[in-house]
Interface confidence: low
């Protein structure tokens, strides 16, 4: 039986050009997670596997960075990054749990944009 | 206007504590993450500790077990409890929102003796 629950980060803003943290957390479960993987509809954004790392997909590796944690970073968002993204929990011995979410990226207004930081 | 402000930096013993905070205003819609992040002199900048809406919290390992970070919704602020600090974590300290748009002008933690 499945008991665990996904907490994300929801429906999220973030204007274009800037950068934006995805996160999910996975509790009430004892389950292993073997691997997570990010999604957007129905392209792999990246994985993290327990045993061997993370791995982004060759077309995002300029855009996206892992972590923190479990999350994903997006970076140089575009309007065309407006969508669902998902973060899919492989476990043992539960199965997967998915997450859902929402980001809208707007055209950017006057705004001050973060510096480069280093996720570890 | 929208404005990050950080306070409650200083300079602290190794072993002692201090508290930062980040008051957010002036954003059209609340963020469901806060964040903070860090830059020591000549380095990167490296995130340190987030937290979601609903409460739940990642750190660095460098800082696990010594940092705690927390929010108050309401008031659009986020804190860091920083214990057992160390000459390492000297830097400047910065929040940041889910969509890491906007930084402020950061706080100042030096940890010596």
């Known amino acids: 039986m499945m008991t665990g629950t996904i907490e994300t980060t929801g429906n999220i803003s973030a204007e274009k050009g800037g950068s934006i943290i995805l996160q999910c957390h996975l509790s009430s479960t004892t389950a292993q997670v073997t691997q997570v993987n990010w999604e957007q509809q129905d392209q792999l954004l990246a994985i993290c596997n327990a045993d061997l790392g993370w791995h982004i997909s060759p077309s995002f590796k300029d855009r996206v960075a892992p972590g923190p944690g479990l999350g994903l970073t997006l970076q140089s968002l575009t309007v065309n990054d407006t969508g669902e993204y998902f973060c899919i929990y492989h476990t043992y011995p539960d199965g997967t749990y998915t997450g859902r979410i929402f980001l809208e990226v707007l055209e950017s207004s006057v705004a001050e944009h973060g510096a480069r930081f280093q996720i570890p | 206007e929208v404005q990050l402000v950080e306070s409650g930096g200083g300079l602290v013993q190794p072993g002692g504590s201090l508290r930062l905070s980040c008051a957010a205003s002036g954003f059209t819609f609340s963020p469901s993450w806060m964040g903070w992040f860090r830059q020591a002199p000549g380095k990167e900048r490296e995130w340190v500790a987030s937290?979601?809406?609903?409460?739940?919290?990642w750190y660095a390992d460098s800082v696990k077990g010594r940092f705690t970070i927390s929010a108050d919704n309401s008031k659009n602020t986020a804190y860091l409890q920083m214990n057992s600090l160390k000459p390492e974590d000297t830097a400047v300290y910065y929040c940041?929102?889910?969509?890491?748009?906007?930084w402020g002008q950061g706080t100042l933690v030096t940890v010596s003796s």
């Open positions: 940041a929102r889910d969509d890491l748009d906007y």
């Open positions: 937290v979601l809406r609903g409460g739940y919290t």
